[in-house]
């Protein structure tokens, strides 16, 4: 069953620094920007297969969330559903469309600087780190008396990519989600058959950076479909 595949186990025995999930078909991907291991997902969906089945929100696209299609429906059957717009009812942040979050059961705008999400409990306060930023601006060594809530740095727990600093995205890492670097030119990427089909990956890679797209590496064109290596390339 899908669930038995999802209930994967310890990651081990792949090339260091990572291992692969025992009995797990998904790709094990290094969190390190330059050390990425390719891996196919044999449970990837077919292009025209709708709706897309899922087990977790992050398996869906950025404008979708994972839930049972019918109210009070079978919890075992879940699909990617369209995100909910402002003022619509919600149960968790992922149900709300980007730029919104779930507050008191309603999707509200996170544009005003009031959204800290649940990650306020693990506020990033970077120091001794040349790359630490404060919402995209360089952090000064002395801050004003106003408490700044800087965005999550690499390795920080997150709920969605907007929780992460510039150049990072929020991606699955085992049973949690953490901020990881957006991929640079030449780095291995995962090409999904349809938007959001992150399927059964234990590690999620971030998407390719601005001006880059995930394409088959030129010298891999002759390879079989299943083993084609995709990398981030200039448009």
């Amino acid at each position: 069953t899908l669930n038995s595949v999802l209930n994967s186990n310890a990651i081990k025995n792949l090339p260091p620094p990572l291992g692969g999930a025992a009995g797990h078909p998904g790709s094990a991907v290094s969190a390190a920007p330059g050390i990425l291991y390719p891996g196919g997902n044999k449970y990837q969906t077919i292009d025209n297969y709708q709706p897309y089945p899922c087990a977790e929100d992050e398996e869906c696209g950025t404008d979708e969330y994972c839930a049972s299609p019918t109210r009070g429906g079978d919890a075992g059957v879940q699909i990617c559903l369209a995100c909910r717009k402002r003022r619509k009812r919600c149960m968790r942040h992922a149900m709300c469309c980007p730029g919104n979050y779930c507050k008191n059961g309603i999707c509200v705008s996170s544009d005003q600087n009031n959204f800290r999400g649940e990650i306020e409990e693990t506020i990033t306060e970077s120091f001794g780190n040349d790359h630490s930023t404060l919402d995209g601006y360089s952090r000064r060594t002395t801050l004003s008396s106003k408490m700044y809530h800087s965005k999550g740095q690499e390795g920080s727990v997150c709920l969605r990519s907007s929780d992460c600093a510039t150049g990072l995205c929020c991606a699955r890492h085992f049973w949690s989600k953490i901020c990881k670097p957006v991929l640079k030119e030449g780095q291995v990427c995962t090409k999904h058959r349809r938007k959001g089909s992150h399927g059964l990956e234990i590690f999620q890679r971030c998407y390719c950076g601005e001006g880059l797209s995930c394409r088959i590496q030129k010298d891999h064109h002759q390879a079989s479909n299943s083993s084609r290596l995709h990398t981030c390339q200039r448009h």
């Epitope: 290094s30 977790e56 740095q153 690499e154 390795g155 890492h173």
Partner: antibody, heavy 115, light 108 residues
Framework: QVQLVESGGGLVQPGGSLRLSCAAS????????MTWVRQAPGKGLEWVSG????????YYADSVKGRFTISRDNSKNTLYLQMNSLRAEDTAVYYC????????WGQGTLVTVSS | DIVLTQSPATLSLSPGERATLSCRAS???????LAWYQQKPGQAPRLLIY???NRATGVPARFSGSGSGTDFTLTISSLEPEDFAVYYC?????????FGQGTKVEIK
């Protein structure tokens, strides 16, 4: 504020079973992966198991694989650890904690496996 | 498995002194997926640092984390009486996530 409260520990004979619970409050439970960590008396910390926010993804240390089962009930904001075929070396304080790096911990519950 | 080795095993210092704790990984972590915890007798551990250098909520500024690759450091700039405890590092790059054996910071 975030609170995690474990229960269910106690004395059990080798080969026996126990079910630990961890009641969570103060945060949106289903948004977070949860973790069980244990600490044998006078020893260091050892990761036991982890489970994703929806419960679809579970992970175990080799030392407990096949004997322990992690699960969660998001409607009750509760995390569980079902421990079967217990051994003397499973004797430890068991902590539940939030996320892959453990930003919040419970107070722990002592499990003693002895005949 | 990635083995984390902490040194020294015990650090004997006086209040006001600077403490430098080391955590060395058996493999390059490449990414800053390392956390530090403080544990006092009879208590649960407490997260101090995550992402190698990010201070957790409510942790005093005297605690700082640094390092990359295989070598990571927790620094307590000026020890307070309440800082005497055992400190653990943890890597969460690969499974099993592993902890160091701990460094005990005791009063000299």
């Amino acid at each position: 504020q975030v609170q995690l409260v474990e229960s269910g520990g106690g004395l059990v004979q080798p080969g026996g079973s126990l079910r630990l619970s961890c009641a969570a409050s103060g945060f949106t439970f289903n948004n977070y992966g949860m973790t069980w960590v244990r600490q044998a008396p006078g020893k260091g910390l050892e990761w036991v198991s982890g489970i994703s926010g929806s419960g679809s993804y579970t992970y175990y240390a080799d030392s407990v694989k096949g004997r322990f089962t992690i699960s969660r009930d998001n409607s009750k904001n509760t995390l569980y650890l079902q421990m079967n075929s217990l051994r003397a070396e499973d004797t430890a304080v068991y902590y539940c904690a939030r996320t892959i790096y453990m930003d919040y911990w419970g107070q722990g519950t002592l499990v003693t496996v002895s005949s | 498995d990635i083995v984390l080795t902490q040194s020294p095993a015990t650090l004997s210092l006086s209040p006001g002194e600077r403490a430098t704790l080391s955590c060395r990984a058996s493999q390059n972590l490449f990414s800053p997926y390392l956390a530090w915890y403080q544990q006092k007798p009879g208590q649960a551990p407490r997260l101090l640092i995550y992402g190698a250098s990010n201070r957790a909520t409510g942790v005093p500024a005297r605690f700082s984390g640094s390092g990359s690759g295989t070598d990571f450091t927790l620094t307590i700039s000026s020890l307070e009486p309440e800082d005497f405890a055992v400190y653990y590092c943890q890597q969460y790059l690969s499974l099993p996530t592993t902890f160091g054996q701990g460094t005990k910071v005791e009063i000299k």
